[in-house]
């Protein structure tokens, strides 16, 4: 990661005045607490069209999104932070086709954290982007109570204690 030389620059001929520097001091809006909702700000920076999406090394591409499958195990909140620090989020599953893609690439039978947890504030299962789960598409096996987070196993979604340690999937 060492950097080679960056040479000093000059402007030959003519008088050059220093350009004014622009500085944006606006704060990144973040919710209080562990849970931080994904913002739409800079969304255009992510991708302009599905066809042009190119994922980083180690990330798999599917339907215009990039997916990363962990090898280690963490709690739901640690997994959540892990994804966030990589400008991504825990997996949000939109349909059964996406679930099939995920299952095909998991290659193991254990639980895997996804971006869904039970929020005591709303008293409902909510995806990390703030949207509610579509009960017509997905059914969650297990208790819907405080400190419950969702994990997938063999194309099914299970309610598990958030402090449990499982593998996880990041998505952007």
């Amino acid at each position: 990661l060492l950097v080679s030389q960056g040479v000093l620059l000059k402007c030959q001929k003519g008088s050059c005045s220093n350009a004014t520097q622009y500085e944006d001091t606006g704060d990144l809006k973040v919710n209080n607490g562990t849970r931080r909702n994904i913002s739409n700000k800079d969304l255009c920076a992510s991708r302009s069209a599905d066809q042009t999406v190119l994922c980083q090394s180690e990330w798999l591409k599917y339907q215009g999104k990039c997916y990363w499958f962990s090898n280690e195990m963490k709690s739901w909140s640690d997994s959540y932070v892990y994804c966030l620090e990589r400008k991504s989020h825990l997996l949000i599953i939109h349909d059964q086709l996406e679930m099939a893609f995920i299952q095909k690439n998991l290659r193991q039978l254990n639980y895997v954290w996804i971006g869904l947890n039970f929020t005591s504030l709303k008293m409902t299962w909510t995806w990390v982007d703030g949207s509610p789960i579509d009960s017509k598409i997905f059914f969650i096996k297990g208790p819907a109570k405080e400190n419950s987070c969702a994990a997938i196993k063999e194309s099914k979604i299970f309610s598990e204690t958030c402090s449990s340690v499982f593998k996880w999937i990041c998505q952007y």
Partner: antibody, heavy 116, light 110 residues
Amino acid sequence: SLEESGGDLVQPEGSLTLTCTASGFSFSSSYCICWVRQAPGKGLEWIGCIYSDSGNTYYASWAKGRFTISKASSTTVTLQMTTLTAADTATYFCARDSGTTSWRYNIWGPGTLVTV
Amino acid sequence: ALVMTQTPSSVSAAVGGTVTIKCQASQSIGNDLAWYQQKPGQPPKLLIYAASNLESGVPSRFRGSGSGTKFTLTISDLECADAATYYCQGTYRGSSISWPFGGGTEVVVK
């Protein structure tokens, strides 16, 4: 804005701690703060970063062990440097990421000079 | 480890002309690339983020393109004030995140 301080003349094998101070915002929110250095007449070199809420740190491979980034308070992040050599002589900058779905280091301090 | 290679190390062009700077990543980084302008005695100034997004306040004469491993910064209608060193910075989103810089390109405006 950001401002670095603590730059000084230090003896070889010595240690030094630099401080990055924020004004107009605090590190209590989720920010990625990075340290970058620039030797005289040379290019920019990434040292490492810290996420202000989790405290998780990431370093360039050459910086691991000798450089430590930590959050000292809600407005300060520090860079501790040990076993300094002449090769560490540089201007040290701190920068803040403002992006959400992409990295956007648009807030930089003016830099502080370290001479070994 | 992610390595960013920037070319050329120096380029010269006349006022009103166009300059193209290239940056290559050692592995695919999607669109996770930024471009900076730096003048002597000043910190770097962000020009482009996410490969092609123009930072607020930066003239549209600066254009970023590319994805994967190959990226380009194009400066058109060159002005004297564009004389500076330009750096690319990639981001690797792997298990250990890294943000290496390219070696820098000197732009001399004649």
